[in-house]
Amino acid sequence: IWELKKDVYVVELDWYPDAPGEMVVLTCDTPEEDGITWTLDQSSEVLGSGKTLTIQVKEFGDAGQYTCHKGGEVLSHSLLLLHKKEDGIWSTDILKDQKEPKNKTFLRCEAKNYSGRFTCWWLTTISTDLTFSVKSSRGSSDPQGVTCGAATLSAERVRGDNKEYEYSVECQEDSACPAAEESLPIEVMVDAVHKLKYENYTSSFFIRDIIKPDPPKNLQLKPLKNSRQVEVSWEYPDTWSTPHSYFSLTFCVQVQGKSKREKKDRVFTDKTSATVICRKNASISVRAQDRYYSSSWSEWASVPCS
Amino acid sequence: RNLPVATPDPGMFPCLHHSQNLLRAVSNMLQKARQTLEFYPCTSEEIDHEDITKDKTSTVEACLPLELTKNESCLNSRETSFITNGSCLASRKTSFMMALCLSSIYEDLKMYQVEFKTMNAKLLMDPKRQIFLDQNMLAVIDELMQALNFNSETVPQKSSLEEPDFYKTKIKLCILLHAFRIRAVTIDRVMSYLNAS
């Protein structure tokens, strides 16, 4: 058993049929010695008396809020949560496996630039009685500070018969130099509590590997005289690291109709303009990627050919 | 010719071309190592990230773009005193401390060149003959060093009398390649910045 936060404790259980469970001793936080009784959750049934209560925790019915009272007055609470371990593996029931970029990916993180600011998100089908808390650091043995905000519900989607909820959190490395060469990864730890179930999820990454620039901005078209070619120009996204001559981007320019199966024109360039062939009912799209370290491409920025 | 000087013509800065070749060659070699050594811990997640130039050179700091010198997090790292020392102090803001920066890059290349050559000599003794260093990568390191055109003491190639542990050597190769790729990215960024200055 360990303390998650004040008056909240996590009991780690090997989860298999007829498992013996864990013996837990709860102590009432009071100077009083006599006349103390214990109850669980909303029940008025007295579980025991005395300053300490010894219980055998085997299942979720044994978890919950234990309260010690004296003469009708509440003295203190202890909330017991369960963390299940099945076949030596901690349970991952609360969050959905996003399977990208690989299986068992529960947390996904992205950074728009090298400032040390990043966003992580996760998915769940659970809609109520759910709380998250996020901690992060650079390195684990001698951790350097990363500050994370509160996790918030950022999107709701319908997937077949199920509703899916996306939560996200923003974090900022306390003292980040955009030009630094990372040798210690960022560690992100998410504590998830659903009712009386506790789970924890972690992710470890270098900012350089989670870079995904915003799409290029200000796409403009200029038809070329006596030609089907069009000059398309754009600018670096505002959120990208500066100076741009140091943090350079490379671009992919594509002309395509509405369907992915349609024919297309595609060209790669390090410049902020390119010449392509425009077709009726097609769109010109441009996306960006770090020129020197191939992490993710940005989403497309698009303008219609017409 | 002593130091490459940034001029308006992008083709006039030879180091830019060489640094782009360097990054491509290292990335290519790293990809090859990851494929060939698929049963060794050779991915970014699996290896320890070591920097053989740590406390010996200061490329990131010496080559900081002017725009980032206002960022205290970029200056309070290991070599601040080195940055503001010596004859470059007066021209710090205007010259991007080019000489110090390029000499630091040169020293990086020299250290990696020695490590890679030593390692290749060991790998050539491996009866499995599983992986060798790409001669193109070694040539590109050499070309960039020549373009930088610094004179410095030659570092003797390390020779080891004991029987090489090929497993350890291959893991060390992965560690070196990962670190060198990160440094090659920095070098490419620096050359691009200098070329645009």
Epitope: K263, R266, T269, T275 | -
Partner: antibody, heavy 118, light 107 residues
Framework: EVQLVQSGAEVKKPGATVKISCKAS????????LHWVRQRPEKGLEWMGW????????EYAPKFQGKVTITADTSTDTGYLELSSLRSEDTAVYYC???????????WGQGTLVTVSS | DIQMTQSPSSVSASVGDRVTITCRAS??????LHWYQQKPGKAPKLLIK???QSISGVPSRFSGYGSGTDFSLTINSLQPEDFARYYC?????????FGGGTKVEIK
């Protein structure tokens, strides 16, 4: 299977015109761009131009402008290359090539040899 | 027009050898470079697109590399069926242009 089948070899006199064909099968003809590429004896490849069969849009390499005309007939899934004012230096194998992407060539015809000789 | 220069114009090699062909553009073309193989009397065949992207059905011994102005095609362990002529082609701008070709011959 995506295939391009070209018409047979042609022998022409200088000053004449020749029209060679390229029949597409295994895909929707208007879904791919169609290009023509020339290869003179013992020489390299030269791109001549392309057509978008969907709308008839064409683009020619400057060196072939006025010399060649590229057309397409969607009713027969066939592309055509017409060469006018033939000279001995037009003796070459002419390939049609197609792709969903405009700028490179995924599928090739077998080639048509055009010989210009008096 | 962008000029594409291939070297060497021919190379003699044995089965099992590693062969590298280079292609240089007269100006930067990013990764807009494609490689083709042509056997005598046959049409060219696409091997690599956009400098390094593999084509399905093409053996993995063929690999492409480069960006900007310098590119290379490597055949890792030469097979009897690889003796042919190889061409690079730029798609950075029209007109599309090819290199002069490199003939890989049996030593």
């Amino acid at each position: 299977e995506v295939q391009l089948v070209q018409s047979g070899a042609e022998v022409k006199k200088p000053g004449a015109t020749v029209k060679i064909s390229c029949k597409a099968s295994g895909y929707t003809f208007s879904d791919y761009y169609l290009h023509w590429v020339r290869q003179r004896p013992e020489k390299g490849l030269e791109w001549m131009g392309w057509i978008d069969p969907e709308n008839g849009d064409t683009e020619y390499a400057p060196k072939f402008q006025g010399k060649v005309t590229i057309t397409a007939d969607t009713s027969t899934d066939t592309g055509y290359l017409e060469l006018s004012s033939l000279r001995s230096e037009d003796t070459a194998v002419y390939y049609c090539a197609a792709n969903k992407e405009l700028r490179y060539f995924d599928v090739w015809g077998q080639g048509t040899l055009v010989t210009v000789s008096s | 027009d962008i000029q594409m220069t291939q070297s060497p114009s021919s190379v003699s090699a044995s089965v099992g050898d590693r062969v590298t062909i280079t292609c240089r553009a007269s100006q930067s073309i990013s990764i807009n470079l494609h490689w083709y193989q042509q056997k005598p009397g046959k049409a060219p065949k696409l091997l690599i697109k956009f400098a390094s992207q593999s084509i399905s059905g093409v053996p993995s011994r063929f690999s492409g590399y480069g960006s900007g102005t310098d590119f290379s095609l490597t055949i890792n362990s030469l097979q009897p069926e690889d003796f042919a002529r190889y061409y690079c082609q730029q798609s950075n701008s029209f007109p599309l242009t090819f290199g002069g070709g490199t003939k890989v011959e049996i030593k």
